[in-house]
Interface confidence: low
């Protein structure tokens, strides 16, 4: 039913569509969803609203990073009386609505996950037509993307005093542990320097002084797997060559 009330602060007449028991907006999202890179993930989002019989136009929106201001990654619109939410935006074509906004469900499927998708996502619904109302989740759902290690760069670089150093950068989630093996490092894996956290999911380990020619191997490992890559150091006339 429709309830009319006087707003005494502004002395305006407000008409609000009211329906017990849900007299105010809420959104329900889990704190976190985990999935592996390359797989798909579902971000659940359901809501309650005070307009139980609302059948007008609506827009469903998902944004990334921060609520209210983050970039939209998905948007769809449903016409009055329609249960079909027509997609207007799907970033890189990887986002698809699973839920039915008419049934208070904005759940979203994200395809072909990458580590860059590891962020917080916020669902939002907007009503237009007879009722003008909107609501957005304030805490959002964290999409936690896991990935086996991948070595993204391995190189030999000149150091002062005609020396050489090796750098190995890997990505993965959980961040992989890096270890070097090679001539004069012993047969066992030896992390010469503690890996340092880089940007996002990148980890870099440095071998500060390569004293012998030969093959140096960087191994990256986490709970999901391991990866290795090698460089070869051979010096002639003060130059170095590296192959991976």
């Amino acid at each position: 039913f429709v309830r009319t009330k006087i707003d005494t602060t502004e002395n305006l007449l407000n008409t609000e569509v009211h329906s017990s028991p849900a007299q105010r907006w809420s959104m329900q999202v889990p704190p976190e969803v985990s999935a592996e890179a390359g797989d798909a993930a579902v971000l659940p989002c359901t809501f309650t609203h005070p307009h139980r019989h609302y059948d007008g136009p609506l827009t469903a929106i998902w944004r990334a990073g921060e609520p209210y201001a983050g970039p939209q990654v998905f948007r769809c619109a449903a016409a009055r009386g329609s249960e079909l939410c027509q997609t207007a935006l799907s970033l890189h074509g990887r986002f698809r609505l699973l839920g039915n906004p008419r049934r208070n469900d904005l759940s979203l499927r994200v395809e072909r996950l990458a580590l860059a998708d590891d962020r917080r996502y916020f669902c939002r619904v907007e009503f237009a037509g007879d009722v003008h109302d909107r609501y957005e989740s304030r805490h959002g759902v964290r999409l936690h993307v896991t990935a086996a290690p991948r070595i993204v760069n391995i190189s030999v670089l000149p150091s002062p005093a005609h020396a050489f150093r090796a750098l190995c950068t890997a990505e993965g989630e959980p961040p992989p542990a890096l270890a070097w093996s090679g001539p004069a490092l012993g047969n066992s894996l030896a992390a010469v320097r503690s890996p340092r956290e880089g940007h996002g999911h990148l980890v870099t380990a440095e071998l500060p002084a390569l004293t012998h020619d030969g093959r140096y191997t960087c191994t990256a490992a986490n709970s999901l797997g391991r990866s290795e890559a090698s460089v070869y150091l051979f010096r002639f006339h003060g130059a170095s060559g590296a192959s991976t």
């Epitope: 017990s20 028991p21 849900a22 007299q23 105010r24 809420s26 329900q28 659940p44 359901t46 309650t48 139980r52 609520p67 209210y68 049934r103 208070n104 469900d105 609501y135 957005e136 304030r138």
Partner: antibody, heavy 114, light 113 residues
Amino acid sequence: QVQLKQSGAELVRPGASVKLSCRASGYTFTDFYINWVKQRPGQGLEWIARIYPGSDETYYNEKFKDKVTLTAEKSSSTAYMQLSSLTSEDSAVYFCALWFFDVWGTGTTVTVSS
Amino acid sequence: DIVMTQSPSSLTVTAGEKVTMSCKSNQSLLNSGDQKNYLTWYQQKPGQPPKLLIYWASTRESGVPDRFTGSGSGTDFTLTISSVQAEDLAIYYCQNDYSYPLTFGAGTKLELK
């Protein structure tokens, strides 16, 4: 008229389990959360958990996670709460309440005694 | 968990008197998104379930007499009964409606002199 009708009082032995029911009427059962709240004699209120019957999504208070299991039966518009491994600490009145606690059931008294 | 602290634990009043009771939370219940305080007040009479009085700290539930007023923001909230009636004798609970687990205060018992 929105109503929540709860099952009758239960007298149970320590270590046993009991399943309480909360039958909803007057609204679309699958649209709104149902909460469960505990009140020990002469004490305050404790939120136990909630269930969204539309998807069976549940949220539990960590304190009750190993004690309670919530389910919902759409066909009968009934929410259930099972309490397991009962002790005297579980003797209480248990209320079901609609999301936002606008509407409450009358409560079910559970007495654990040998 | 958010802890809700109510005071006093009991109040003895005479009919027609103005009454205030306090509820404090150890974390802010103000949601920056919609600028609402997610604090709810309930009234519970003996042998009955609680009854919703006020939500969003100050919005009176439909059918609740206007002698009941909620106020406050952030972590400090107050329930005021402008002129206590005999039917108001009950226990009043405040509740964190902002984050899970939802938590209640221990209650303020209103008794008649």
